[in-house]
């Protein structure tokens, strides 16, 4: 079938990095500057994508391959592709309509991206608190009560959580 | 092509203004947040303001709120921010960006930047 295919079409035979020429009797030329294409038989080149503004290039484009971008420092990658940048917010913090804000009391959020989270509720396991919960910080749950000899532990049971703030606000 | 113009920067006096403008084509500017962006010499990209598609929700990053005013004229494909009481901390290049598409709802992702107009406050 390729052979087949071969004979008909002689696209067939151009190679990634090159294009089938229509104005020069299907002849396959290379990709000219600033294109390429990933696959044979191509009857265009397609134009590399540029990686401008808050985009930094990550990977060149070549006559096979598009370029790659990412984000500048202090904004991260978003969709298919790093088709978005987006901010940075401080660890503790929440990215919202009004920008970087503070996770409110009895959340956290331990990356400079997504949204602040509640801290776990220890007893629901049963299980009591032996480390505070910060803004940054979940909570660590330690055994519970019952597995302690009585008056041994001075750990307080935790505050209950609250909803966290949902980015965006 | 898709493209966003900055213009309107300069030096200007403490407790000045400037009215910087971005002027987008190549896109319906009218289905877009638009979102202003700056970065002070040796710092940093900072937010500055964003405003939604209809120009009916605006935000402003606190040193900013009460002093600038972002808006746009969709009939027009231009984005604007109205800044007054500048002071020393304000120079900084400003960028205009395009929110990408779900921006505000389930994102902050911008897919399309201007290349700057230079701010100077200075006496």
């Known amino acids: 079938f390729e052979r087949t295919r071969s004979l008909q079409d002689p696209c067939s035979n151009c190679p990634a990095g090159t294009f089938c020429d229509n104005n020069r009797n299907q002849i396959c030329s290379p990709c000219p500057p600033n294109s390429f294409s990933s696959a044979g038989g191509q009857r265009t080149c397609d134009i590399c994508r540029q990686c401008k503004g808050v985009f930094r290039t990550r990977k060149e484009c070549s006559s096979t391959s598009n370029a790659e971008c990412d984000c500048t420092p202090g904004f991260h990658c978003l969709g298919a592709g790093c088709s978005m940048c987006e901010q940075d917010c401080k660890q503790g913090q929440e990215l919202t309509k009004k920008g970087c804000k503070d996770c409110c009391f009895g959340t956290f959020n331990d990356q400079k991206r997504g949204i602040c989270r509640p801290w776990t509720n220890c007893s629901l396991d049963g299980k009591s608190v032996l480390v505070n919960g910060t803004k940054e910080r979940d909570v660590v749950c330690g055994p519970s009560p019952a597995d302690l000899s009585p008056g041994a532990s001075s750990v307080t049971p935790p505050a209950p959580a609250r909803e966290p703030g949902h980015s965006p606000q | 092509e898709v493209q966003l113009v900055e213009s309107g920067g300069g030096l200007v006096q403490p407790g000045g203004s400037l009215r910087l403008s971005c002027a987008a084509s190549?896109?319906?500017?009218?289905?877009?947040?638009m979102t202003w962006f700056r970065q002070a010499p040796g710092k940093g990209l900072e937010w500055v303001a964003h405003?939604?598609?209809?120009?009916?929700?605006?935000y402003y990053e606190d040193s900013v709120e009460g002093r600038f005013t972002v808006s746009r004229d969709n009939a027009k494909n231009s984005l604007y921010l109205q800044m007054n009481s500048l002071r020393a901390e304000d120079t900084a290049v400003y960028y205009c960006?395009?929110?990408?598409?779900?921006?505000?709802?389930?994102?902050?992702?911008?897919?399309?930047w201007g290349q700057g107009t230079t701010v100077t406050v200075s006496s």
């Open positions: 960006a395009r929110g990408g598409d779900g921006y505000s709802d389930s994102h902050f992702g911008v897919d399309v």
């Open positions: 190549g896109f319906t500017f009218s289905s877009h947040w």
């Open positions: 405003i939604k598609e209809d120009g009916s929700e605006k």
